[in-house]
Interface confidence: medium
């Protein structure tokens, strides 16, 4: 047993543009409160019942009235921690939902009005007894900063709160086979209290109240010897005496889920998927009605017609599940075209478009060259959401505004000297070479490797490279 503790540090506008409007006004003062829901395991879809580990509601925060014209500040928060007690072992991995609710305190008929301001959800690994874990979550334009930890309630200790500690009976040492309880060195690990009647010779337990059998024994209290004539053997250690597998207890054996819940094994333990109207680690809690507020994310609770269903949640757009606890991943349909980034803001989908594209789904390919001038006779070339200038000779840079140095690349071969010219470059060739870039040797007999020098140009004259 232990307690999950949640400390809300701040709730206010997140960084960046588009600050949210203050949730309260001079005409409608309001105050905040928070709701946390925890469930075991890492899968948000694993259990229909959203709060199998427990849930808690904060106190109401101080009344807040918006100052007209002022930006929304961090809003005043309720005092104290949100505490969610857990009765069994801490699962180590858990999913959380934290909702920020607004209570409007105007002149509503029939009492204050509640509305959901923001909801954040996540999956985390957390060992009990560790330090506060810090977190920042964003919901639309709001930002929630909080910390959380799981701590064991004495006498439980350990990362799952399954080891028990008791004060030492003798001042100097612990009993046989029992270790000191670090860091409480003056205490000893207590023997676990197994299920009543569990065989002390053939059974053992790793968690209070269970009875796990040693090899060769079976039954709820490990008092029945395993028949060696037929090996059923889906699981469990190999038996040295019979040469076959002995069935060991699996976490779902005997179905620990009550009230028609279905059991599925997890790496550490088991998880129950509860029918509507039941929740808890083993679906043992029943009788949920609309008065318990079982619908998350602004879902509308309606009393169920049939006796098995005490309530029905009508979910707002973007949520599903019997308690509206599951967010519909609307971005999985990839609504944003041309590589746009999909953002599910809860109330709406938004596409953040790549450069060169626009529209609600980034479906419009902008004319990259519209309004883009390339200087000095350059021409604009479109491509991939960006524009590029193809520059005239002698110019370079993004917009052809930079004068290029045509000699920078040393274009004249065989020691020829390069001269920048208004329309390009000129190579003055070393003796024995000719051509636009001095690339052709002049033959010893006076004939060149070129077909013929143009009239009026002698081999060795500067050749202008166009």
């Amino acid at each position: 047993a232990g307690v999950f503790e949640l400390q809300i540090h701040s709730f206010g506008p997140g960084p960046g543009p588009g600050a949210p409007r203050s949730p309260c006004s001079a005409r409608l003062p309001c105050r905040l409160f928070f709701r946390v829901c925890l469930k075991p395991g890492l899968s948000e879809e694993a259990a229909e019942s959203p709060c199998a580990l427990g849930a808690a509601l904060s106190a109401r925060g101080p009344v807040y009235t918006e100052q007209p014209g002022a930006p929304a500040p961090d809003l005043p928060l309720p005092d104290g921690l949100l505490q969610v007690p857990f009765r069994d072992a801490w699962p180590g991995t858990f999913s959380f939902i934290i909702e920020t609710w607004r209570e409007e305190l105007g002149d509503q008929i029939g009492g204050p009005a509640w509305s959901l301001l923001a909801r954040v959800a996540g999956r985390r690994r957390l060992a009990a007894g560790g330090p506060w874990a810090r977190d920042i979550q964003r919901a639309g334009a709001w930002e929630l900063r909080f910390s959380y930890r799981a701590r064991c309630e004495p006498p439980a200790v350990g990362t799952a709160c399954t080891r028990l500690c008791r004060p030492r009976s003798a001042p100097s040492r612990c009993g046989p086979g029992l270790r000191p309880c670090a860091p409480l060195e003056d205490e000893c690990e207590a023997p676990l209290v197994c299920r009543a009647g569990c065989s002390p010779e053939h059974g053992f337990c790793e968690q209070p109240g269970e009875c796990r059998c040693l090899e060769g024994w079976t039954g709820p209290l490990c008092t029945v010897p395993v028949s060696t004539s037929s090996c059923l053997s889906p699981r469990g250690p190999s038996s040295a005496t019979t040469g076959c597998l002995v069935p060991g207890p699996g976490p779902c054996d005997g179905n620990p889920c009550a009230n028609g819940g279905s059991c599925s094994e997890t790496p550490r333990s088991f998880e129950c998927t509860c029918p509507r109207g039941f929740y808890g680690l083993r679906c043992e809690v029943s009788g949920v009605t609309c008065a318990d507020g079982p619908c998350f994310n602004g879902g509308l609770c309606v009393g169920g017609a049939d006796p098995d269903s005490a309530y029905i949640c009508h979910c707002p757009p973007g949520f599903q599940g019997s308690n509206c606890e599951k967010r519909v991943d609307r971005c999985s349909l990839q609504p944003c075209r041309n590589g746009g980034l999909c953002l599910d803001l809860g109330h709406a989908l938004r596409c953040r478009c790549r450069a060169g594209f626009a529209g609600p789904r980034c479906e419009h390919d902008l004319d990259d060259c519209a309004g883009r001038a390339c200087a000095n006779g350059g021409t604009c070339v479109e491509g991939g959401g960006a524009h590029r200038c193809s520059c005239a000779l002698g110019f370079g840079g993004r917009d052809c505004r930079e004068r290029a140095d045509p000699c920078a690349a040393r274009p004249c071969a065989h020691g020829g000297r390069c001269y920048a010219h208004f329309s390009g470059l000129v190579c003055a060739c070393a003796p024995g070479y000719m051509g636009a870039r001095c690339e052709f040797p002049v033959h010893p007999d006076g004939a060149s490797a070129l077909p013929a020098a143009p009239p009026g140009l002698r081999p060795g004259d500067p050749q202008r490279y166009l």
Partner: antibody, heavy 121, light 107 residues
């Protein structure tokens, strides 16, 4: 009582590494983040990073990324900070500091006595 | 990174004086601000956390205020043991950063 005791002063050559230890006592070592902060002679305080002693997770300041390694040994309630490729600019007093018992507000409640690291050729 | 600017960098005061030190953040840090006192050759000591909460064991003459970007540490009546250097530190986001310090000297 709650205290952090650090290893003794070190003199290192440029390019070498230094490993400073910080032994915790009087509290549950795995229950609080451990931070490392340094202070060059006559200068202000500079945060280097933290380690979660429970999980071993770390968070280093970008400036020290690739040069600093923070580790812990829970069996002896000790945190370590190793800084490599030392230069004269790393001459400083290095402190370990424990998070306050407040919900992860990164306030440094308990400090070690400091370890002077001198880098000189 | 969030820059923290403290002012003044040093001040001279007498025993019994009211002393105010300010700290400004380069962006809003809500109330994620802590104050420390450091004496020569010693490790810093936490005085105030979360902008205005007094750390246990710290005399009530120390107080903190502010939110957002502007914060103040006030010593209502300076005592001989208060002559030291004071640092502010933001814990809104990593890297955690400190102000440059304010040295309080005897006039």
């Amino acid at each position: 009582q709650v205290q952090l005791v650090q290893s003794g002063a070190e003199v290192k050559k440029p390019g070498a590494s230094v490993k400073v230890s910080c032994k915790a006592s009087g509290y549950t070592f795995t229950g609080y983040y451990m931070h490392w902060v340094r202070q060059a002679p006559g200068q202000g305080l500079e945060w280097m990073g933290w380690i979660n002693p429970n999980s071993g997770d770390t968070n280093y300041a970008q400036k020290f990324q690739g040069r600093v390694t923070m580790t812990r040994d829970t069996s002896i309630s000790t945190a370590y900070m190793e800084l490599s490729r030392l230069t004269s600019d790393d001459t400083a007093v290095y402190y370990c500091a424990r998070d306050a018992n407040i919900a992860a507000l990164d306030a440094f409640e308990i400090w070690g006595q400091g370890t002077m690291v001198t880098v000189s050729s | 990174d969030i820059q923290m600017t403290q002012s003044p960098s040093s001040l001279s005061a007498s025993v019994g004086d009211r002393v105010t030190i300010t700290c400004r953040a380069s962006q809003s840090i809500s109330s994620y601000l802590n104050w420390y006192q450091q004496k020569p050759g010693k490790a810093p000591k936490l005085l105030i956390y979360a902008a205005s909460s007094l750390q246990s064991g710290v005399p009530s003459r120390f107080s903190g205020s502010g939110s957002g970007t502007d914060f103040t540490l006030t010593i209502s009546s300076l005592q001989p043991e208060d002559f030291a250097t004071y640092y502010c530190q933001q814990s809104y986001s990593t890297p955690l950063t400190f102000g440059g310090g304010t040295k309080v000297e005897i006039k």
